[in-house]
Interface confidence: low
């Protein structure tokens, strides 16, 4: 015998309380396939989520993120804060720690400044949270004990890098 519920189109549910009549999904619910015995509750895009597509009787709402945030996960299940240049998202918010930089807008992670000494080069321009160190040409001769003071832009003091 054919299941009478199979005749119920998307946007309805097969209502056992009404002798398996196809009843329209109540407000704020949907069924995207035929033959459903219940309608699913519409997703609500609240807070940092905003509505990209309204819920209809046959399809769920779709969310994206408010400005300053971007989607993560299947179907935009999470909104993650956009970080500016010079920042990455940490538990404490958007920032780059000393000695690291991020030159991308909205994405990316903070990477350590280039260690110029590994290539036998001097520091031509100090790094910032947004820009990497600029290394100069290779140093022809130097004393291994020489230190230079590197002060990040806007930073209160310096710290030493062994070159």
């Amino acid at each position: 015998l054919q299941d009478p519920c199979s005749n119920c189109p998307a946007g309805t549910f097969c209502d056992n309380n009404r002798n398996q009549i196809c009843s329209p999904c109540p407000p704020n619910s949907f069924s995207s396939a035929g033959g459903q015995r219940t309608c699913d509750i519409c997703r609500q895009c609240k807070g940092v989520f905003r509505t990209r597509k309204e819920c209809s009787s046959t399809s769920n709402a779709e969310c994206d993120c408010t400005p300053g945030f971007h989607c993560l996960g299947a179907g935009c299940s999470m909104c993650e804060q956009d970080c500016k240049q010079g920042q990455e998202l940490t538990k404490k918010g958007c920032k780059c720690s000393l000695g690291t930089f991020n030159d991308q807008n909205g994405t990316g992670v903070c990477r350590p400044w280039t260690n110029c000494s590994l290539d036998g080069r001097s520091v031509l321009k100090t790094g910032t949270t947004e820009k990497d160190v600029v290394c100069g040409p290779p140093v022809v001769s130097f004393s291994p004990s020489t230190t230079i003071s590197v002060t990040p832009e806007g930073g209160p003091g310096g710290h030493s890098l062994q070159v």
Epitope: N7, P9, P24, C25, S32, G34, G35
Partner: antibody
Framework: QVQLQESGPGLVKPSETLSITCTVS????????VHWVRQPPGKGLEGLGV???????NYNSALMSRLTISKDNSKSQVSLKMSSLTAADTAMYYC???????????WGQGTTVTVSS | DIQMTQSPSSLSASLGDRVTISCSAS??????LNWYQQKPDGTVKLLIY???TLHSGVPSRFSGSGSGTDFTLTISSLQPEDVATYYC?????????FGGGTKLEIK
């Protein structure tokens, strides 16, 4: 996006049987119903009948004895057959998708059928 | 079968006018009424379902109201692209039936 396309013979002789096909793309016939509607020249819309996702049908009571609606889910096609045609069956024939809130949200562009000898 | 009667059968209005089309059912149909627009080229589109719910993409100048046996489609400010024939359709009882249509023209 969802599209419905009717195809028919154009010209049919009186007393013959009309056969029209509605091909559905972008939507499953196992999730939606398809309703047939016709419009005689210069007149209004007339519902002919519907086939539901599970395959059962409902027909316009005045035309029930002459109408058969069937479908092939695998081909995404719905067919309308109407027997014993007369000049009064000359019309534009439309198929339309039926959603669960009982409206026709997508319509085909229609196919013209002329019954004449 | 439930009979649906529309009035007027045709009307002519000026751009920017407020236009109302009436639809009457031969018996009570609660709010189970839809409105469709048929353009001169034969294209049919859903405008409003369940008496007053605007279908997606339909301009907000269209609205619907009513309950029971008497229903109204209103266009708040007539635009050139609104030239069409408008049909009401009941879905309270099978077979679903249409009104006779209202042909709307611009003066």
């Amino acid at each position: 996006q969802v599209q419905l396309q009717e195809s028919g013979p154009g010209l049919v002789k009186p007393s013959e049987t009309l056969s029209i096909t509605c091909t559905v793309s972008g939507s499953s016939l196992t999730s939606y119903g398809v309703h047939w509607v016709r419009q005689p020249p210069g007149k209004g819309l007339e519902g002919l009948g519907v086939i539901w996702p599970g395959g059962s049908t409902n027909y316009n009571s005045a035309l029930m004895s002459r109408l058969t609606i069937s479908k092939d889910n695998s081909k995404s096609q719905v067919s309308l057959k109407m027997s014993s045609l007369t000049a009064a069956d000359t019309a534009m024939y439309y198929c339309a998708r039926v959603t669960g809130t009982w409206y026709f949200d997508v319509w085909g562009q229609g196919t013209t059928v002329t019954v004449s000898s | 079968d439930i009979q649906m009667t529309q009035s007027p059968s045709s009307l002519s209005a000026s751009l920017g006018d407020r236009v109302t089309i009436s639809c009457s059912a031969s018996q009570g149909i609660s709010n189970y009424l839809n409105w469709y627009q048929q353009k001169p080229d034969g294209t049919v589109k859903l405008l409003i379902y369940y008496t007053s719910t605007l279908h997606s993409g339909v301009p907000s100048r269209f609205s619907g109201s009513g309950s029971g046996t008497d229903f109204t489609l209103t266009i708040s400010s007539l635009q050139p692209e609104d030239v069409a024939t408008y049909y009401c359709q009941q879905y309270s009882k099978l077979p679903w039936t249409f009104g006779g249509g209202t042909k709307l023209e611009i003066k």
